[in-house]
């Protein structure tokens, strides 16, 4: 008789999940000399240990501490780029501006980027059929808790001027319920971080509005100011041109507003 399996609302674990995590770890440590000391088999064992045999709605940050310890990484604290609902452009930016880092440019962020995973209570099996959805099932699921944990640590490490890319095409440009709004904003350290600079990315070609005046941006400014961190905001009217000018800053068209 087959054992009854919990049917969750979200997609199941990404195919070849263990192999992908291990392979990404090996690739990352080969490319980044400062992480060559990392033992990728131990990283996988710690990752697996965080969720295997545990109820996928009862995962805690504590479960991920062994993995966090193994993946400890020093990134230049004044070169951090946060993002909310605009991952693609943020990653395209750091691919060009190689001295800046998103969370997914770190070892732990890269390991889990685009992946889904969960286990089952009391069995060593990985659930490839379904995993809990944050909204429909539970928030303390393996994926959500992982990103909450690494995002908090990433924000805590930031210093000087921290940049955040926000999606100007969304109804809530700043969303208090996003990882940025609920975790990262509250874990920037006022004694280390001088300024949070928001880059609001415009979607439409003809959109010339000053989205820095948007009520949700004002809300962000208020939260940040109350935490004794300065706030500044820039409109990026032409994201395509913005990237082009990051690639070729000497281009004559790059002196005008983008």
């Amino acid at each position: 008789v087959p054992r009854w399996r919990q049917q969750w609302s979200g997609p199941g674990t990404t195919k070849r999940f263990p192999e992908t995590v291990l392979a990404r770890c090996v690739k990352y440590t080969e490319i980044h000399p400062e992480m060559r000391h990392v033992d990728c088999q131990s990283v996988w064992d710690a990752f697996k240990g965080a969720f295997i045999s545990k109820h996928p709605c009862n995962i805690t940050e504590e479960d991920y501490q062994p993995l966090m310890k193994l993946g400890t990484q020093t990134v230049p604290c004044n070169k951090i780029l946060l993002w909310s609902r605009i991952k693609d452009l943020a990653h395209q930016f750091t691919q060009v501006q190689r001295d800046m880092f998103t969370l997914e440019d770190t070892l732990l962020g890269y390991l889990a980027d685009d992946l889904t995973w969960c286990g089952e209570f009391n069995t060593s099996k990985i659930n490839y059929q379904s995993c809990p959805d944050w909204r429909k099932d539970c928030s303390n699921n393996p994926v959500s808790v992982f990103w909450k944990t690494v995002s908090r640590r990433f924000a805590e490490a930031a210093c000087d001027v921290v940049h955040v890319m926000l999606n100007g095409s969304r109804s809530k440009i700043f969303d208090k319920n996003s990882t940025f709004g609920s975790v990262e904003v509250h874990n920037l350290q006022p004694e280390k971080v001088q300024t949070l600079e928001a880059w609001v990315i415009h979607g439409g070609r003809e959109d010339s509005r000053d989205l820095c005046q948007d009520p949700t941006i004002k809300e962000l400014e208020s939260i940040i100011s109350k935490r004794n961190i300065q706030f500044s905001c820039k409109n990026i009217y032409r994201p395509d041109k913005f990237l082009q000018c990051v690639k070729n800053p000497e281009d004559s068209s790059c002196t005008s507003e983008i």
């Epitope: 070849r16 690739k27 990352y28």
Partner: antibody, heavy 126, light 107 residues
């Protein structure tokens, strides 16, 4: 959801060049290989080559070496393929297809293709 | 280049039948083999990867087995929507190569 959208049909004369595009969405573009596969009318599938968008390195089937160039634009999540010196036997449907996670593929030698574009019909005729 | 040989090249069967298609590699490829289904005018669709792993969303009547040089795709009980052409592909090394295809037709 993961999607690959290819450029429209083309009619070309022998000797001309062909430029095809494949725009990806729904996943982290630089984390996966992109393959090109073609299929002549009534024939089987033929692998042409692959590009790694993380860095742009390419590998081509020997048959197409020197006549094909694959490039990528990470700012638009688009992969391009140029085929030069077209001949009538280049008449085919050209598919782009997403490969495995590139770290996984290289580590385990596992180069399958899980998502395909809709195909671009190319006719080469004088 | 690794040569992939599929058999049979065509096959007639009825709804409900159990069908097996075989694929042989000219040299060992471990379990790096994929199976695709293609319908006329459509792009191929991945069914099986790593010789025996079922791609997400593919019905469980499809299964794959084998390693090294000999592989099989089995459809346990044919459904009307399964009539199509099936290709194996070695996923072990460049250049990637496909079998010539097996056309599965209604008897």
């Amino acid at each position: 959801q993961v999607q690959l959208v290819q450029s429209g049909s083309e009619v070309k004369k022998p000797g001309a060049s062909l430029h095809l595009s494949c725009k990806a969405s729904g996943y982290t573009f630089i984390n996966h290989y992109m393959h090109w596969v073609r299929q002549a009318p009534g024939q089987g599938l033929e692998w042409m080559g692959v590009i790694n968008p993380r860095g742009g390195s390419t590998t081509y089937a020997q048959k197409f070496q020197g006549r094909v160039a694959m490039t990528t634009d990470t700012s638009t999540y688009t992969v391009y393929m140029e085929v030069n010196s077209l001949r009538s036997d280049d008449t085919a449907v050209y598919f782009c297809a997403r490969g495995s996670d590139n770290a996984l593929a290289d580590y385990y030698n596992s180069y399958d293709m899980d998502v395909w574009g809709q195909g671009t019909t190319v006719t080469v005729s004088s | 280049a690794i040569r992939m040989t599929q058999s049979p090249s065509s096959l007639s069967a009825s709804v409900g039948d159990r069908v097996t298609i075989t694929c042989r590699a000219s040299q060992g490829i471990s379990s790096a083999l994929a199976w695709y289904q293609q319908k006329p005018g459509k792009a191929p669709k991945l069914l099986i990867y790593d010789a025996s792993s079922l791609e997400s969303g593919v019905p469980s009547r499809f299964s794959g087995s084998g390693s090294g040089t000999d592989f099989t795709l089995t459809i346990s009980s044919l459904q009307p929507e399964d009539f199509a052409t099936y290709y194996c592909q070695q996923a072990n090394s460049f250049p990637l190569t496909f079998g010539q295809g097996t056309k599965l037709e209604i008897k």
